[in-house]
């Protein structure tokens, strides 16, 4: 029986050109975490394996950094990075737990000025 729950940072926003940490945490289970896969929609971003360590997909190597912990750091954000991210915890003996994070990348100037200056 799967008793664990995944806590995530939920819906987050960040500025274009900046960086963001994606974090998930598995709790309420004694299951052993063997691997955590990070996905963006239908793309595998990175894998952290208990034995092998980190593998970052080559196409994301320039902008994705492992950690902190089992989390993932996205750098040099673009508007195209907006979307859903998933942390997939492979555990034994429970099986697989999945957490979801929604990231919105904002144009920094638009975000700032849009909030402060309302056109009547």
């Amino acid at each position: 029986m799967m008793t664990g729950t995944i806590e995530t940072t939920g819906n987050i926003s960040a500025e274009k050109g900046g960086s963001i940490i994606l974090q998930c945490h598995l709790s309420s289970t004694t299951a052993q975490v063997t691997q955590v896969n990070w996905e963006q929609q239908d793309q595998l971003l990175a894998i952290c394996n208990a034995d092998l360590g980190w593998h970052i997909s080559p196409s994301f190597k320039d902008r994705v950094a492992p950690g902190p912990g089992l989390g993932l750091t996205l750098q040099s954000l673009t508007v195209n990075d907006t979307g859903e991210y998933f942390c997939i915890y492979h555990t034994y003996p429970d099986g697989t737990y999945t957490g979801r994070i929604f990231l919105e990348v904002l144009e920094s100037s638009v975000a700032e000025h849009g909030a402060r200056f309302q056109i009547p």
């Epitope: 063997t34 595998l44 034995d51 196409s59 492979h90 034994y92």
Partner: antibody, heavy 118, light 107 residues
């Protein structure tokens, strides 16, 4: 250099048993998921079974479930496939394979031929 | 189980040709799709993993694309040593499953 060397294949009668072994070297065997993949003569590839690094997690193809058992001895750097109740359709070359992150197969053995015939 | 359908099952091409092989999964497999090359009497060789990542040592004329259910292996300029059989394989869930293979022959 990564090496996977299968042994134990041969001719066996229907209903018989065989145990295949795969001796691994050149990498930290205990850290990797390992699998057996087979190929019948003139046919495509079929995944047979897989075992995660700590032996806790195992998986089998429906066609061999209940008849084949995958196991490993990390102290001996060896992967095994115990095959019971063999059938003619199990005739194939059996490959031992390394599966990093349980996602892709980056190294294969040279294969060992199992022939099930009376 | 997830079914993998490859097309075409065989094709004839000339050296220098651009060759495209497609693979379709019976359900979404994200980018958990790998491509292998096999020559007669030899073990398969990994070309592309996770849909688009080129395995170390594999020539850059090989490329992979796609996500979800539809994937493509492209050989930009076919070389004599590329005549072989190519297989796709999903690792989204067990049992792992392979496509039926595409045999690339000399025209």
């Amino acid at each position: 250099e990564v090496q996977l060397l299968e042994s134990g294949g041969g001719l066996v009668q229907p209903g018989g048993s065989l145990r295949l072994s795969c001796a691994a070297s050149g990498f930290t065997f205990s850290s990797y998921t390992m699998s057996w993949v087979r190929q019948a003569p003139g046919k495509g590839l079929e995944w047979v079974a897989g075992i995660w690094s700590d032996s806790g997690n195992k998986g089998y193809a429906d066609s061999v479930k209940g008849r084949f058992t995958i196991s490993r001895d990390n102290s001996k750097n060896t992967l095994y496939l115990q095959m019971n109740s063999l059938r003619a359709e199990d005739t194939a070359v059996y490959y031992c394979a390394r599966v990093p992150y349980s996602v892709w197969i980056d190294y294969w053995g040279q294969g060992t031929l199992v022939t099930v015939s009376s | 189980d997830i079914q993998m359908t490859q097309s075409p099952s065989s094709l004839s091409a000339s050296v220098g040709d651009r060759v495209t092989i497609t693979c379709r999964a019976s359900q979404s497999i994200s980018s958990y799709l790998n491509w292998y090359q096999q020559k007669p009497g030899k073990a398969p060789k990994l070309l592309i993993y996770a849909a688009s990542s080129l395995q170390s040592g594999v020539p850059s004329r090989f490329s992979g694309s796609g996500s979800g259910t539809d994937f493509t292996l492209t050989i930009s300029s076919l070389q004599p040593e590329d005549f072989a059989t190519y297989y796709c394989q999903q690792s989204y869930s067990t049992p792992l499953t392979f496509g039926g293979g595409t045999k690339v022959e000399i025209k």
